[in-house]
């Protein structure tokens, strides 16, 4: 039998995400993060 | 509020065609993921599912009627139209239409029912 | 086509007493999505069907809590903890995974 239309079953789960870079000081290079839901994973 | 009222001719001969019309309120038939489903349960018996129309037009039917079923929809008038050719006194029932909404936003089920309308056919 | 078969087909019950339909496919109806489309309706005398619980086990927004569903495959069964007056009618399963959409035959719940 075929298959009734549905959704994929998966909901996305829309976020902004944010790349930043900061200086931290003369001899630390920079830092570069990854703010998802405005907690740094990277 | 949500509502859907069917109507039909309630009394026609065998081999006529009958034509029925859902008429939706409170909802758009141009929703993204909405849908209009008709059902039949004859009297005293259970229930039984005719056909679905989506949003897209795109359309599903059950293939033991589907050579005598044609479903679709008017969303100017936000109206679904069922027809169902060569009638027969086997197709004496209640007939109703009910919504289902895909995705987020609905439960996809059947979450609101019409009150439905008897066709009695006989010669 | 998948059959759906519902035991018992009638259910005298005690106001107060618990009740259980099961509800049973002759195939499995987990969707290609990895979601299980099973669904119950209750028709009450002189009424439209009306949505209990969908998706085997989410309760329709209203639908007091006395009522339940679960399984998964081909088993399924609807609960109500406490049986009130208001619950009388019939009780029917729905797949809606695969085409066409197909019923139980129904189970009449009275009150004793």
């Known amino acids: 039998d075929a298959e009734f239309r549905h959704d994929s079953g998966y909901e996305v789960h829309h976020q902004k995400l944010v790349f930043f870079a900061e200086d931290v000081g003369s001899n630390k290079g920079a830092i570069i993060g990854l703010m998802v839901g405005g907690v740094v994973i990277a | 509020q949500v509502t859907l009222k069917e109507s039909g001719p309630g009394l026609l001969k065998p081999t006529q065609t009958l034509t029925l019309t859902c008429t939706l309120s409170g909802f758009s038939l141009s929703t993204s993921g909405m849908g209009v489903g008709w059902f039949r349960q004859p009297p005293g018996k259970g229930l039984e599912w005719l056909a679905h129309i989506w949003w897209d037009d795109d359309k599903s039917y059950n293939p033991s009627l589907k050579s005598r079923l044609t479903i679709s929809k008017d969303t100017s008038k936000n109206q679904v139209v069922l027809t169902i050719t060569n009638v027969d006194p086997v197709d004496t029932a209640t007939y109703y239409c009910?919504?289902?909404?895909?995705?987020?936003?609905?439960?996809?089920?059947?979450?609101?029912w019409g009150q439905g309308t008897t066709v009695t056919v006989s010669s | 086509d998948v059959v759906m078969t519902q035991t018992p087909l009638s259910l005298p019950v005690t106001p107060g007493q618990p009740a259980s339909i099961s509800c049973r496919s002759s195939?499995?109806?987990?969707?290609?999505?990895?979601?299980?489309?099973l669904e119950w309706y209750l028709q009450k005398p002189g009424q439209s069907p009306q949505l209990l619980i969908y998706?085997?086990?989410n309760r329709f927004s209203g639908v007091p809590d006395r009522f339940s569903g679960s399984g998964s495959g081909t088993d399924f069964t609807l609960k109500i903890s406490r049986v009130e007056a208001e619950d009388v009618g019939v009780y029917y399963c729905?797949?809606?995974?695969?085409?066409?959409?197909?019923f139980g035959q129904g189970t009449k719940l009275e009150i004793k």
């Open positions: 009910a919504r289902r909404q895909l995705g987020t936003r609905g439960t996809d089920a059947m979450d609101y």
């Open positions: 729905l797949q809606t995974t695969r085409v066409p959409l197909t």
């Open positions: 195939q499995s109806i987990l969707h290609s999505n990895g979601n299980t489309y």
């Open positions: 998706k085997v086990s």
